[in-house]
């Protein structure tokens, strides 16, 4: 149990859990450095709770702190491609609404050929993130090498 | 206080904040890929609040989603060293039981000596979680340099 | 709604939520390879929710187990750079009070500009968190390339 | 059922140029990677050029890399491989080739191959 | 780029028996990126083997792959008459991919 009774009755989106794990669906086509996500039980072990997918980028439902992570892998890659086709970058961020675009993660590639961080930030119910793959190289999609989740941590 | 008084007469356990930090105790034996943990106060820094090691490896016993790091640090490493005796490869999974086996989390050092990540992932009662690294380069054991730790976040 | 009513009139803090995320403000002067930190929605999108600041270093204000990470970008940087310079490394430790002084995470740029990483680690009411970068590299104060941030995750 | 067809290999002199064309069907074209492989006569295979899925991400071996182009289109299910300046060395048989769903380079359907003979 | 070395050049056996066939990369493979293809003469590679162990869909079980880092290899645990072929290995963890020259199983 994890609160006392009274608080079983609540379902558990009340209690503001709000948490996503996504896997890479697809790139983007020309000129689009989007990576596309999708996320469910389907799937294997990606789901959605509380956010949705809206065009494969993730959307916010509840106003808090989230702890943002994301893993990358590229999938033709050696530490001499990486630095070759330097610089592949991957920034996450905010892309819509317009007015609150801004970038909130970025790491770039260099000689390794995966990159993962995470960090703490607010988001407002609507948000929508993106994450930006500049470069000419394409990350794997196994589901053990790229992901991109978030976790709701408090108001 | 963490929360109202009616609720802090309950253990915190039954409030499902399972959570362990371990520090690397040692490497297993030739063919045997494993690091193997260890964890509790007298150790330093390391704790299992919930989970428990089996013969050094993680038993998770509260189903949910868990937010799951790790950082391994080689010892012996320089960029060289690293590209020369390269692939090293870390890979975070579910080892028992055998039906629920899956790679939950892998990375390469490339020319790097340190890898670190994290994820969220769905785990059940007695699921067994292994690391492994494959390579010939050994694992530092510094406190602060390598650890593998998990977090209860939701059910 | 977070939790039931009851629990909707106790203040956050008292929830035991304390949580903070804080941007580069400037490096150390010789001699004193400390980072400082900033943090407030005046500075974008960081804040302070329990920990507070004392003199750009972080000061814990409620016992528990907490989640730390951190990103750092070096600014001037390339593969080469990262290489020549090498060893350029960060520390993120307790730093004060002096009698609980300890490296709690290591990490070495080598080939690379950019470390990331996070974990699990129990931090007491006074204690003051210090990030060591040492090396000649200087790290970049672009909000979403280098951050330091702490989240309560349990007593 | 997967079908790669190739298409468009035959005779050319040193320097000219020839233009590849693979017809994909009985997959999702616009969701896989894929690659050129060739073959030259009684010799090793090699791979030659790839594309992501949505032809945002391209990649060539050092050997073709300023001469050929990869490319496809979605819309009709073709893969494409324009060689110019070609060499006596770029004589083989080509092949399209899949990747695996992960993106990474190993290759679960092929084309039968077209010939590309430069002399 | 990495180098794959197969040996032997031929393997002259007879159905029934057992084939061992090995590939050795100039560096290490990684995270065992790594596969096996049957060519028969006039015809395209057939996908046999990725991930060094996993057989692709629709192998026989008596094909298996092992082996990382360095070496691998791809045994036959009893040659039935259609696995008379040319043999390929194939690393993938680092680009660009690259092939082996091959092992022709013949029968003796």
């Known amino acids: 149990q994890r609160f006392a009774q009274a608080q079983q009755q609540l379902p558990l989106e009340s209690l503001g859990w709000d948490v996503a794990e996504l896997q890479l669906n697809h790139t983007g086509p020309q000129q689009d450095p989007r990576l596309y996500w999708q996320g469910g039980p389907a799937l294997g072990r990606s789901f959605l709770h509380g956010p949705e997918l809206d065009k494969g980028q993730l959307r916010i439902h509840r106003d808090g702190i989230y702890m943002v992570h994301i893993q990358v892998t590229l999938a033709i890659c050696s530490s001499t491609t990486a630095s070759r086709h330097h610089p592949t970058t991957l920034a996450v961020g905010i892309c819509s609404p317009a007015s609150r675009s801004i970038s909130l993660l970025r790491l770039s590639f260099h000689q390794g050929c995966t990159i993962a961080s995470q960090r703490l930030t607010p988001l407002a119910r609507g948000d929508t993130l993106c994450t930006n793959l500049t470069g000419t190289l394409l990350p794997s999609r196994n589901t053990d090498e790229t992901f991109f989740g978030v976790q709701w941590v408090r108001p | 206080q963490r929360f109202a008084q009616a609720q802090q007469q309950l253990p915190l356990e039954s409030l499902g904040w399972d959570v362990a930090e371990l520090q690397l105790n040692h490497t297993g034996p030739q063919q045997d890929p494993r690091l193997y943990w260890q964890g509790g106060p007298a150790l330093g820094r390391s704790f299992l609040h919930g989970p428990e090691l089996d013969k050094g490896q993680l038993r998770i016993h509260r189903d949910g989603i868990y937010m799951v790091h790790i950082q391994v640090t080689l010892a012996i490493c320089s960029s060289t060293t690293a590209s020369r005796h390269h692939p090293t490869t870390l890979a975070v999974g579910i080892c028992s039981p055998a039906s629920r086996s899956i790679s939950l989390l892998r990375l390469s050092f490339h020319q790097g000596c340190t890898i670190a990540s994290q994820r969220l992932t769905p785990l059940a009662r007695g699921d067994t979680l292994c690391t492994n690294l494959t390579g010939t380069l050994l694992p530092s054991r510094n406190t602060d340099e390598t650890f593998f730790g998990v977090q209860w976040v939701r059910p | 709604q977070r939790f039931a009513q009851a629990q909707q009139q106790l203040p956050l803090e008292s929830l035991g939520w304390d949580v903070a995320e804080l941007q580069l403000n400037h490096t150390g002067p010789q001699q004193d390879p400390r980072l400082y930190w900033q943090g407030g929605p005046a500075l974008g999108r960081s804040f302070l929710h329990g920990p507070e600041l004392d003199k750009g270093q972080l000061r814990i204000h409620r016992d528990g187990i907490y989640m730390v990470h951190i990103q750092v970008t070096l600014a001037i940087c390339s593969s080469t750079t990262a290489s020549r310079h090498h060893p350029t490394t960060l520390a993120v430790g307790i730093c004060s009070p002096a009698s609980r002084s300890i490296s709690l995470l290591r990490l070495s740029f080598h080939q690379g500009c950019t470390i990331a990483s996070q974990r699990l680690t129990p931090l007491a009411r006074g204690d003051t968190l210090c990030t060591n970068l040492t090396g000649t590299l200087l790290p970049s104060r672009n909000t979403d390339e280098t951050f330091f941030g702490v989240q309560w995750v349990r007593p | 059922e997967v079908q790669l067809l190739e298409s468009g290999g035959g005779l050319v002199q040193p320097g000219g140029s020839l233009r590849l064309s693979c017809a994909a069907s009985?997959?999702?074209?616009?969701?896989?990677?894929m690659s050129w492989v060739r073959q030259a006569p009684g010799k090793c295979l090699e791979w030659v050029s790839a594309?992501?899925?949505?032809?945002?991400?391209?990649y060539y071996a050092e050997s073709v890399k300023g001469r050929f182009t990869i490319s496809r289109d979605n819309s009709k299910n073709t893969l494409s491989l324009l060689m110019n300046s070609l060499r006596a060395e770029d004589t083989a048989v080509y092949y399209c080739?899949?990747?695996?769903?992960?993106?990474?380079?190993?290759?679960?359907?092929w084309g039968q191959g077209t010939l590309v003979t430069v002399s | 780029e990495i180098v794959l070395t197969q040996s032997p050049g031929t393997l002259s056996l007879s159905p029934g028996e057992r084939a061992t066939l090995s590939c050795r990369a100039s560096q290490g493979v990684r995270s065992s990126y790594f596969a096996w293809y049957q060519q028969k003469p006039g015809q395209a590679p057939r996908l046999l083997i990725y991930g060094a162990s996993t057989r692709a869909t629709g192998i026989p079980a008596r094909f298996s792959g092992s082996g990382s880092g360095t070496d691998f290899t791809l045994t036959i645990s009893r040659l039935e008459p259609e696995d008379f072929a040319v043999y390929y290995c194939?690393?993938?963890?680092?680009?660009?991919?690259?092939f082996g020259c091959g092992t022709k199983v013949e029968i003796k």
């Open positions: 009985g997959f999702t074209f616009s969701s896989y990677a």
């Open positions: 594309i992501g899925e949505g032809g945002g991400y391209t």
């Open positions: 080739a899949r990747h695996d769903y992960s993106n990474y380079p190993y290759f679960d359907y």
């Open positions: 194939q690393q993938y963890g680092s680009s660009p991919p690259t």
